[in-house]
């Protein structure tokens, strides 16, 4: 009898533990933002990408804020940040201005309290995209572990925005909290 009661108590304690873990996990901030293809800037210069989806398709956000093209941190912590940017061109969409391209992404952190901006990650390459080739494609993926404070903002800059692949599985960025700051 007593064995049965102990087992039952353990089950109850375990489920409370699971529930506590689950609620803590649910409170863990995360975001996965996908490019808004209707509002991609044109040209070849470096620009900040301000139009992202946060609530459709693969895009989701929880306990973080998306505002004015920036992902805003609501909780201090160590976060894993990532970005995937795809560039593509098909001759049916027009000509390339130049065959020599610098295709880059910059993940930037901006602090409002102490006005400052830092590039956290960058990636890319110089490419030769011949005008005689029918199709071109290039993908950049960057990721890293960073200490972020509440109120800090994450934004994405790219070169050659007119060459961005507008699909949700191609151009996206995100963050998730891994642990608290001790």
């Amino acid at each position: 009898g007593s064995q049965h009661i102990r087992a039952e108590k353990a089950m109850v304690d375990g489920s409370w533990l699971d529930l506590a873990k689950r609620s803590k996990l649910e409170a863990q901030p995360f975001a996965h933002l996908t490019i808004n293809a209707t509002d991609i800037p044109s040209g070849s210069h470096k620009v900040s990408l301000s139009s992202w989806y946060h609530d459709r398709g693969w895009a989701k956000i929880s306990n973080m804020t998306f505002s004015n093209g920036k992902l805003i941190v609501n909780q201090d912590g160590f976060y894993y940040l990532y970005a995937n940017i795809c560039f593509r061109h098909h001759e049916t969409s027009g000509d390339l201005a130049t065959e020599y391209l610098q295709l880059m992404v910059y993940v930037t952190k901006t602090s409002i309290k102490i006005p400052s901006s830092h590039t956290l990650m960058k990636g890319g390459s110089t490419k030769y995209w011949s005008g005689n080739s029918e199709f071109h494609f290039y993908s950049i993926n960057v990721g890293g572990f960073f200490k972020l404070r509440s109120g800090e903002e994450i934004s994405i800059e790219v070169s050659n925005p007119s060459l961005l692949d507008p699909d949700q599985d191609a151009t996206y960025f995100g963050a998730f909290k891994v642990r608290d700051i001790d």
């Epitope: 044109s42 070849s44 001759e91 027009g94 000509d95 201005a97 011949s130």
Partner: antibody
Amino acid sequence: QVQLVQSGAELKKPGASVKLSCKASGYTFTTYWLQWVRQAPGQGLEWMGAIYPGPGNTKYTQKFKDRFTITADTSKSTAYMQLNSLKSEDSAVYYCARRGSRRGIAYWGQGTLVTVSA
Amino acid sequence: NIVLTQSPASLAVSLGQRATISCRASESVDSYGRSFMHWYQQRPGQPPTLLIYLASNLESGVPVRFSGSGSRTDFTLTIDPVEADDAATYYCQQDNEDPYTFGGGTKLEIK
């Protein structure tokens, strides 16, 4: 539909300059090279050069490089070509043109006749 | 510069027969698995019209009587069967390499 409309005929004296225009419509002006081709009376076609209107990148045939300039006004979706130090052998019909969605020049302006005569 | 030599300079073909025009390039116009050679028809007082692009592709709206073939340096435009409306001058053009160049033209007369 893609349309290229060129300015009217010009009569010029040797040594003078001429500036022709080509107004594009029916497509995004800043996404294709716009080309210039000329044809002297009874002669064949001669490719002169091209401009990529956004950043204004240009390419020219060596023969014309010193006295030929192509420009573009993106706000007017219009390209211009200027030929300086005109000679009688510059008398020709001048066409602006654009490639098709694949390759080859699928779209042509109606042509502008330039006559160089003393 | 790539020089394109067309032959013959002129030809006369009977109605319903086959017309063949040749274009030879001074160097290969092939790259990335494609041949950057195109064919145009021009009637007097009119701008040229694109017939064939990338050596063998028929431009939209062009009758199937027109066909193109060839690769690297040797290309052919074939009109079969020839119709009265085909009397015109035909040009080849390459855009594999700047500056783009045209052939000298072939004048087709219908007998």
